[in-house]
Interface confidence: low
């Protein structure tokens, strides 16, 4: 059998195979050693008994999408049946005090591979044997502690395969410079040691994407905005737009990145080299936000231009001394750059909101018959922007960390936005008061520290003012 017979039904065209050469990978036309690595079709009854105590699940993830030319990383994690785990020596053991369907196990081992490998029958003096090989016959690499690695992972994509010896989690990175754009399929088959052979325990596949567009995400936030995820924001307050570029392999780390914004409100194009910008909308309405990200990324070199008919006359330099301005080195012929772009578009709605809230006065309310330990305090509050419909107060300790009391109530405020909020305080001392005014779309906060004095029993007949 050949690798492609074993590893998947997806057969790439000859063109795909030729143009998607992955560095360090081998052609799936190679022969597969079925004697050491048996092949079971999906639904074969032997899968049921391939692992003691249940089925092993392989979880394959990748950091796709990948910008062409960058590295994409695949991670396979093995999930063992309940109560089983891999120990420091690579053996599979039962977790202490963990009860599964079979109850508590007396034998600590599910698979004691250390004992198996100590039985070195058939090995030559180098520690290598006919069974310490991959499915294509290549010998296992002898890393320190390689004997503790008891799983063989075979990755398969684009008509090529990659073999890796590992523990219950492995990672493989692939450079995408030669990968065709679009969605591709990665398939992984996992084998475990079984004496001097291997047994398949799991198969998994996942789609990954290679793109020539920079993957771009934008987070939008604004002070006083009640719900940051609804793409509705407030007029006359700056919105912070933060651009996140999905570049897990840091391919663009040394690239120069440029952000071109159009906020859709006739303010023109805003061009920045910073990934964070602020913009204030001064009108209500719906606006189309557009961002183009440009990066000069490493890329293939164009063919050299034909030589000029004759050399140009040398001319004196007009620039300042120093041939490496601004720390940007000239690009040598073999290290060319290509422009890559990313795009983001969103429709945002701008509405009136509460822009600011201020406590302009606090007054101790004098009561005719004061409670034994209670004080009433009036907070005179003003606001700017839209008219609030609710007020909330949170009374806490002087550090503003331990909440003692929280009260919300509807309010009816005139257009001047001047209101009085009365709150009770139990006992004297210093309190932190967070006062929030809200409406459907906004929430504006102000804080103050107040001192409530001791009640003088002799002044119990003070009139309320």
């Amino acid at each position: 059998k050949r690798f492609h017979d074993v590893l998947g039904n997806e057969r790439p065209s000859a063109y795909m195979r030729e143009h998607n050469q992955l560095n360090g990978w081998s052609s799936d036309e190679n022969d597969w050693n079925e004697k050491l690595y048996p092949v079971w079709k999906r639904g074969d009854m032997r899968w049921k008994n391939s692992w003691k105590g249940g089925r092993v699940q392989a979880v394959l993830t990748s950091d796709s999408p990948a910008l062409v030319g960058s590295n994409i990383t695949f991670v396979v994690n093995l999930v063992f049946p309940r109560c089983q785990k891999e120990d420091a020596n690579g053996n599979i053991v039962y977790e202490k005090n963990c009860r599964n369907e079979a109850g508590l196990s007396a034998d600590p081992y599910v698979y004691n591979w250390t004992a198996w490998s100590e039985d070195s029958d058939g090995e030559n003096g180098t520690g290598q044997s006919h069974h310490n090989v991959f499915p294509d016959g290549k010998p296992f690499p002898h890393h320190p502690g390689w004997r503790r690695w008891n799983f063989v992972y075979v990755f398969h994509t684009l008509g090529q395969y990659f073999q890796k010896l590992g523990r219950c989690s492995v990672r493989v990175s692939v450079n995408t410079a030669n990968v065709t754009l679009g969605p591709q399929l990665m398939e992984v088959t996992v084998y475990r040691r079984h004496g001097r052979a291997y047994v398949p325990i799991a198969q998994v596949k996942d789609v990954y994407v290679v793109t020539d567009q920079i993957p771009v995400f934008v987070t939008m936030s604004q002070k006083n905005d009640r719900n940051s995820s609804d793409e509705t924001f407030l007029k006359d307050l700056p919105i912070t737009f933060d651009v996140l570029i999905h570049d897990p392999s840091h391919f663009l780390n040394y690239s120069t990145i440029n952000y071109k914004w159009s906020f859709g409100d006739n303010t023109g194009l805003f061009v920045s080299i910073n990934h964070t910008v602020n913009h204030t909308y001064v009108l209500n309405g719906t606006f189309s936000l557009n961002l183009t990200v440009k990066a000069a990324a490493p890329g293939p070199c164009p063919p050299p231009p034909p030589p000029p008919p004759r050399p140009p006359k040398p001319t004196p330099s007009l620039g300042p001394a120093g041939d490496n301005p601004l720390g940007l080195s000239e690009i040598p012929d073999e290290n060319c750059q290509i422009n890559r772009y990313g795009h983001f578009q969103a429709t945002i709605t701008i509405v009136e909101g509460i822009l600011e809230v201020n406590i302009i006065q606090t007054t101790d309310v004098l009561m005719l018959v004061p409670g034994p330990d209670s004080s009433l305090i009036d907070f005179v509050v003003t606001c700017q922007g839209s008219i609030p419909t609710e007020v909330c107060t949170i009374i806490s300790d002087p550090t503003c960390e331990i909440t003692q009391n929280a009260v919300c109530s509807p309010v009816d405020v005139d257009e001047m936005c001047l209101l009085t909020v009365r709150r009770a305080f139990n006992g004297s001392g210093t309190y932190c008061v967070n006062l929030t005014l809200g409406d459907d779309t906004s929430l504006a906060l102000t804080s103050t520290l107040i001192s409530v004095p001791d009640r003088d029993p002799a002044s119990s007949l003070r009139m309320a003012n």
Epitope: S272, S317, G319, P320, N339
Partner: antibody, heavy 120, light 107 residues
Framework: QLQLQQSGTEVVKPGASVKIPCKAS????????MNWVKQRPGKGLEWIGQ????????NDNGKFEGKATLTVDKSSNTAYIQLSSLTSEDSAVYFC?????????????WGQGTSVTVSS | SIVMTQTPKFLLVSAGDRVTITCKAS??????VAWFQQKPGQSPELLIY???NRYTGVPDRFTASGYGTDFTFTISAVQAEDLAVYFC?????????FGGGTRLEIK
């Protein structure tokens, strides 16, 4: 040797057009912005716009819309500014200046300038 | 457009004097400010980029600082060859805009 070579002087009639070249040498032409800046006699500097030869992307000063058009010819490493419907207000020295992609307005090398005189 | 207000317009100083020029942006431009020197009959030359970074080959008597809206440019000890017009320029917002210039003359 890094250079931005501009033509010396252009005398043109009102209403006509002029196309000013800026020939770059000694650096990776496609990987830097090329800016154009106007300076009227005894006056300050006015940024007209910039073009990225790698892909022809431009950023323009809206004030010069309809007046200035920026182009490049990558085969000859030359940037051009075309000024149309010329009036006496367009009489000035026009500089080309490059800037790195990541510091797109920090113009680190300048041409010697082309003087344009609009006169009948 | 961002307006860059540069002061003073004119400076008459003696060799060895310390000189400071200020530039105020009409709104925040982060640290994306450059300073240029233009000697009589010549093209402008870049002295400072990103508000405070001295360009290759620029003598260390030229320094600058600032962030947001307020920027300063200093020549610690003026020399005769510093006779020139100095411009600030913001390159945060497009269109990029220059200050009106400061003419430095030596007594």
């Amino acid at each position: 040797q890094l250079q931005l070579q501009q033509s010396g002087t252009e005398v043109v009639k009102p209403g006509a057009s002029v196309k000013i070249p800026c020939k770059a040498s000694g650096y990776a032409f496609s990987s830097y912005w090329m800016n154009w800046v106007k300076q009227r006699p005894g006056k300050g500097l006015e940024w007209i716009g910039q073009i990225y030869p790698g892909d022809g992307d431009t950023n323009d000063n809206g004030k010069f819309e309809g007046k200035a058009t920026l182009t490049v010819d990558k085969s000859s490493n030359t940037a051009y500014i075309q000024l149309s419907s010329l009036t006496s207000e367009d009489s000035a020295v026009y500089f080309c200046a490059r800037s790195p992609l990541h510091l797109r307005g920090s113009m680190d090398y300048w041409g010697q300038g082309t003087s344009v005189t609009v006169s009948s | 457009s961002i307006v860059m207000t540069q002061t003073p317009k004119f400076l008459l100083v003696s060799a060895g004097d310390r000189v400071t020029i200020t530039c105020k942006a009409s709104q925040s431009v982060s640290n994306d400010v450059a300073w240029f020197q233009q000697k009589p009959g010549q093209s402008p030359e870049l002295l400072i980029y990103s508000a405070s970074n001295r360009y290759t080959g620029v003598p260390d008597r030229f320094t600058a600082s600032g962030y947001g809206t307020d920027f300063t440019f200093t020549i610690s000890a003026v020399q005769a060859e510093d006779l020139a017009v100095y411009f600030c320029q913001q390159n945060y917002y497009s269109p990029f805009t220059f200050g009106g210039g400061t003419r430095l003359e030596i007594k």
